[in-house]
């Protein structure tokens, strides 16, 4: 049973005579008269077991003391620390020729942990140990003892274990403590990589390459490696690990970001406070959740504040110019905290009687510079229909508008385009033809471009080729042309008039009057 004694972290103790409770029971040769186990009081008045020999009167001493078998535990080089006290031969009366002041240290490798006898020829000498000039004065009980400490190393070792032996050649000596240890580079964390306990190499100059493993919640950036030096010190750290998203380095560990903090990527950065208008409610957040009514665009970095869609544009002004409209407005009061504001124009064509019945304007309308994604606060809209009710909506949008399409983001204006000359009449028909008259009917122009005040019918005999024509005006979309000559070809043109003027004449309609009094009904463009 061993008591706990504190040694450096890079030393692993294989034997510590000071920690053994009770007798050490090492083997001495000769059994009597040589090394003897003795209890002394240590500095804490606790008994400790020591071995002493003081055969200083007789020459040619050869007293051996052998430890129990010491396991190697995979170490290739071990260190032996001996604390001993040596009595000065001058302090012993009448022993000048026979007293010595050194002893010898030996070892013997063996796989057998039960060797009962000391066979001197099996042992290999490590060194002759002498008391240093510099000794430590240690208080043993109430007396000052001159305590020497000597450390020797031996290796490379290959068998399961070994024995140590101490040969006395006539000194007055006590082994106060014998400690055998090997050196390791202790488990450590460097650059967020954990390196395991690593036994040093066999040579005093060897370096053992060790690959580290990333600590919990981290990942390799570059392969982490270190070298374990012979003295048990880690050398030359290479590579590193980075804390995963949601974690930061604290005390050599990757710890979860605290509530209210986040980390988006595996970097060496620390967790950052949640950006404005966002929060995290769990530890280990990789991003922060936007507050209600706030959003983050797809390409917004996690570090950016959460933002809102903008409020509606202000001060929308319209300027109608015939079938064109120029619109201008001011930026919204609240941009939502974003710089990427732009404007979209929505055009709706509305009925005069019921403005709520609106339809999209369609593709015939043109916008300058463009309809959507406007960066300026003005737009020119052309190719509108004349004398038509239009509602224009200007939508302020930014990168998060799509997440919250709210009508508050737009401002609208309703305008009526100016009247214009109507378009031509597409279809004119002869409804009834007699010897002396033709009854005509037609459709309203596709684009009246205002209120149709009247229609004008122009007709002439085909042979005259428009050199001599007559005009008939009517508010209706039909008329009877009378006083015609029988059996004569006539050409008819119809046009509409608004306050803005006449439109173009329709395509010619050729009709031939009859010779007999019967009625011929026609609906084509060229009745005969």
């Amino acid at each position: 049973v061993t008591g706990s004694r504190v040694y450096p972290a890079n030393e692993v103790t294989l034997l510590d005579s000071r920690s053994v409770q009770g007798e050490l029971g090492w083997i001495a040769s000769p059994l009597e008269g040589g090394w003897e186990e003795v209890s002394i009081m240590d500095e804490k008045n606790t008994p400790i077991r020591t071995y002493q020999v003081c055969n200083v009167m007789e020459p040619s001493q050869n007293n051996w003391l052998r430890t129990d078998w010491i396991t190697r535990e995979g170490a290739q080089r071990v260190y032996i620390e001996i604390k001993f006290t040596l009595r000065d031969c001058n302090s012993l009366p009448g022993v000048m020729g026979t007293c010595k002041e050194t002893f010898n240290l030996y070892y013997y490798e063996s796989d057998n942990d039960k060797e009962r006898f000391i066979r001197e020829n099996q042992f290999v000498k490590i060194d002759t140990i002498a008391a240093d000039e510099s000794f430590t004065q240690v208080d043993i009980g109430d007396r000052i003892m001159k305590l020497n400490t000597e450390i020797r190393d031996v290796g490379p070792l290959s068998k399961k274990g070994f024995y140590l032996a101490f040969q006395d050649v006539g000194a007055c000596i006590a082994l106060v403590s014998v400690r055998v240890f090997y050196k390791k580079c202790p488990l450590t964390v460097r650059n967020l990589a954990q390196f395991p306990d690593t036994i040093t190499g066999a040579d005093t100059s060897s370096l053992v390459e060790v690959r580290g493993s990333c600590v919990n919640n981290s990942e390799e950036k570059d392969v982490p490696k270190m070298y374990c030096g012979a003295d048990g010190e880690w050398l030359v750290p290479i590579g590193n690990c980075l804390c995963n998203a949601g974690h930061e380095e604290r005390s050599g560990e990757c710890q979860a970001c605290k509530i209210g903090y986040y980390k988006a990527l595996s970097t060496d950065a620390t967790c950052a406070k949640c950006p404005p208008h966002s929060y995290s409610v769990w530890e280990g957040a990789t991003s922060c959740t936007c507050d209600r009514g706030f959003f983050r665009a797809d390409n917004d970095a996690a570090s950016m504040p959460c933002t809102r869609p903008p409020s509606a544009p202000l001060n929308l002004i319209s300027n109608v110019n015939e079938t064109s409209v120029n619109l201008e407005w001011s930026s919204p009061q609240n941009t939502g905290g974003r710089q990427d504001i732009s404007y979209n124009v929505v055009c709706k064509k509305c009925g005069a009687g019921d403005p709520s019945k609106c339809r999209p304007c369609g593709s015939g309308v043109h916008y300058t510079p463009q309809q959507n994604g406007l960066k300026t606060t003005k737009v020119s809209i052309t190719d509108l229909l004349a004398h038509t009710n239009y509602t224009f909506e200007i939508w302020a949008v930014n990168g998060v508008s799509k997440y919250n399409p709210n009508p508050d983001q737009s401002v609208s204006v309703t305008v009526t385009t100016n009247q214009a000359a109507p378009s031509s009449i597409a279809l004119v028909q002869a409804k009834e033809v007699t010897r002396y008259s033709v009854a005509l009917a037609w459709l309203e122009p596709d684009r009246p471009n205002g209120v149709i005040l009247e229609y004008e019918v122009k007709y002439y005999e085909k042979d005259q080729n428009e050199r001599s024509y007559r005009i008939v005006r009517t508010a209706a979309r039909n008329t009877d042309i009378k006083g015609l000559n029988p059996l004569t070809s006539y050409v008819f043109h119809v046009r509409a008039r608004t306050a803005a003027g006449y439109g173009d004449f329709s395509e010619p309609l050729e009709v031939t009057t009859n010779t007999v009094p019967s009625r011929i009904i026609g609906d084509g463009a060229n009745s005969t």
Epitope: M57, E58, R87, P93, C172, A174
Partner: antibody
Amino acid sequence: QVQLLQSGAEVKKPGASVKVPCKASGYTFTSRAMSWVRQAPGQGLEWMGWINTNTGNPTYAQGFTGRFVFSLDTSVSTAYLQISSLKAEDTAVYYCARVRFTVYGDGMDVWGQGTLVTVSS
Amino acid sequence: EIVLTQSPATLSVSPGERATLSCRASQSVSSNLAWYQQKPGQAPRLLIYGASTWATGIPDRFSASGSGTDFTLTISRVEPEDFAVYYCQQYGPSWTFGQGTKVEIK
């Protein structure tokens, strides 16, 4: 086991001599010094001196020079105390004791059973 | 010559009690002091040497301390076989004993 064997009691007349043997066994005789201690009846212990069993070199305490001689016969592992010109005040038990030198200090770790020398006319 | 004075001359204790014996030197003897036990009709027995180191086979109820001029031998719990006379002895260039302390049954 280690032991020191002394002879039985001696009765001597004043002026006579006595030689008290101390035979050692159980260890190498020449490896340990031998000390002599006197204890008068009802009194305490008195150290007389010691002899180096390897060299034969004796050391005498104050008051034990002249009439007291330490000697050896290493062939039989025996130390001797010889007292000449005995006086009545020499009446005492005489102990031989093996001297133990150690790093930590010295002491007499093995004692003979003692020889009572009585000096009486 | 260094004179050792032991006190008390007689110490009366009951078995199981603690006994403390004192030895004072007329000048410093460093740690060069030993303690012996002597029972009637027997040779002395070495208990302690080097002021505090147990001799072989001595039970650990015996302990000793001190250096220089003041030394103490303590028997933590006196057993029946511990009733005896106890001597201190210094070993410098010349050795001397104290006059002894008798430990008797109370």
